[in-house]
């Protein structure tokens, strides 16, 4: 039975040209996290394999950085980066857990950021 839950940064906003950290945290399960994938709509941005490390898609390597932790940093944001992002936790034996984050990239210099997210 899948007992885990994913906490995410939720709905966040950031300024055009700036950067943002996407964070998810899996809790309430003893399942082994074997890999975390980060996706934007239907595109795979990055893979973090628990043993074999981070791998950033060539399409995004100039604007995506691994971490902190299992999170993902998006840089040089454009309005086209607005949309849904998903963290997909592959675990054993539970299976797959998915978290959703909505990012809005604003032209304004007064972008309000969501509450700071910290992994306990």
């Amino acid at each position: 039975m899948m007992t885990g839950t994913i906490e995410t940064t939720g709905n966040i906003s950031a300024e055009k040209g700036g950067s943002i950290i996407l964070q998810c945290h899996l809790s309430s399960t003893t399942a082994q996290v074997t890999q975390v994938n980060w996706e934007q709509q239907d595109q795979l941005l990055a893979i973090c394999n628990a043993d074999l490390g981070w791998h950033i898609s060539p399409s995004f390597k100039d604007r995506v950085a691994p971490g902190p932790g299992l999170g993902l940093t998006l840089q040089s944001l454009t309005v086209n980066d607005t949309g849904e992002y998903f963290c997909i936790y592959h675990t054993y034996p539970d299976g797959t857990y998915t978290g959703r984050i909505f990012l809005e990239v604003l032209e304004s210099s007064v972008a309000e950021h969501g509450a700071r997210f910290q992994i306990p």
Partner: antibody
Framework: QVQLQESGGELGKPGGSLRLSCAAS????????MSWVRQAPGKGLELVAT????????YYPDSVKGRFTISRDNSKNTLYLQMDSLRAEDTAVYYC????????????WGQGTLVTVSS | DIQMTQSPSTLSAFVGDTITITCKAS??????VSWYQQKPGQPPKLLIY???TRHTGVPDRFSGSGSGTDYTLTISSLQAEDVAVYYC?????????FGQGTKVDIK
């Protein structure tokens, strides 16, 4: 240049044990996760174990979970695969492999060592 | 586990031909696919990763493409030294699984 050299492959009996070794050179071994991949005679490839750079995290598919143990000694630049409760279907060439730097694919492979399980 | 099904299982073509090997995943693997070449008695050699990025030193007659569940390896102007078994591998989900292989030879 990166070099990986497996050893320890031999004839094992069903229910028995074997330990494979992979000596690594030409790179900072302690900075890389490593893997074992096997290939049964005339068959395809199967990833059977992975381990992170410091040995603190490991992964096994269901086919070998509970029977195989991957480990490493970074002071000796050596990767190991302890194979217990051997079965006939474990007969294969066993390769140690490393991903390329920034490459989502196994760019470096040893020459392999043959394990034969038979009574 | 994600199954990777390659077709055809064997392929015979003339030197200079363009050939295509297909790999179909049992679910969307979002371009997390690599391709390998294995010659008899040798370990596999990485050709392509992230579906279409050629590995260092790989001749440009080898190319990869695809998305979703369907991926292809194309060898243009097939050479005698390309005789080998070719494997795809997905990295989208653990365990990272391989296709069963496609054997390529020369007519």
């Amino acid at each position: 240049q990166v070099q990986l050299q497996e050893s320890g492959g031999e004839l094992g009996k069903p229910g028995g044990s074997l330990r494979l070794s992979c000596a690594a050179s030409g790179f900072t071994f302690s900075s890389y996760g490593m893997s074992w991949v096997r290939q049964a005679p005339g068959k395809g490839l199967e990833l059977v174990a992975t381990i992170n750079s410091n040995g603190g995290s490991t992964y096994y598919p269901d086919s070998v979970k509970g029977r195989f143990t991957i480990s490493r000694d970074n002071s000796k630049n050596t990767l190991y695969l302890q194979m217990d409760s051997l079965r006939a279907e474990d007969t294969a060439v066993y390769y140690c492999a490393r991903l390329g730097t920034g490459t989502l694919g196994f760019a470096y492979w040893g020459q392999g060592t043959l394990v034969t399980v038979s009574s | 586990d994600i199954q990777m099904t390659q077709s055809p299982s064997t392929l015979s073509a003339f030197v200079g031909d363009t050939i295509t090997i297909t790999c179909k995943a049992s679910q969307d693997v979002k371009t997390a696919v690599s391709w390998y070449q294995q010659k008899p008695g040798q370990p596999p050699k990485l050709l392509i990763y992230w579906a279409s990025t050629r590995h260092t030193g790989v001749p440009d007659r080898f190319s990869g493409s695809g998305s979703g569940t369907d991926y292809t390896l194309t060898i243009s102007s097939l050479q005698a030294e390309d005789v080998a078994v070719y494997y795809c591998q997905q990295h989208y989900s653990t365990p990272w699984t391989f296709g069963q292989g496609t054997k390529v030879d020369i007519k």
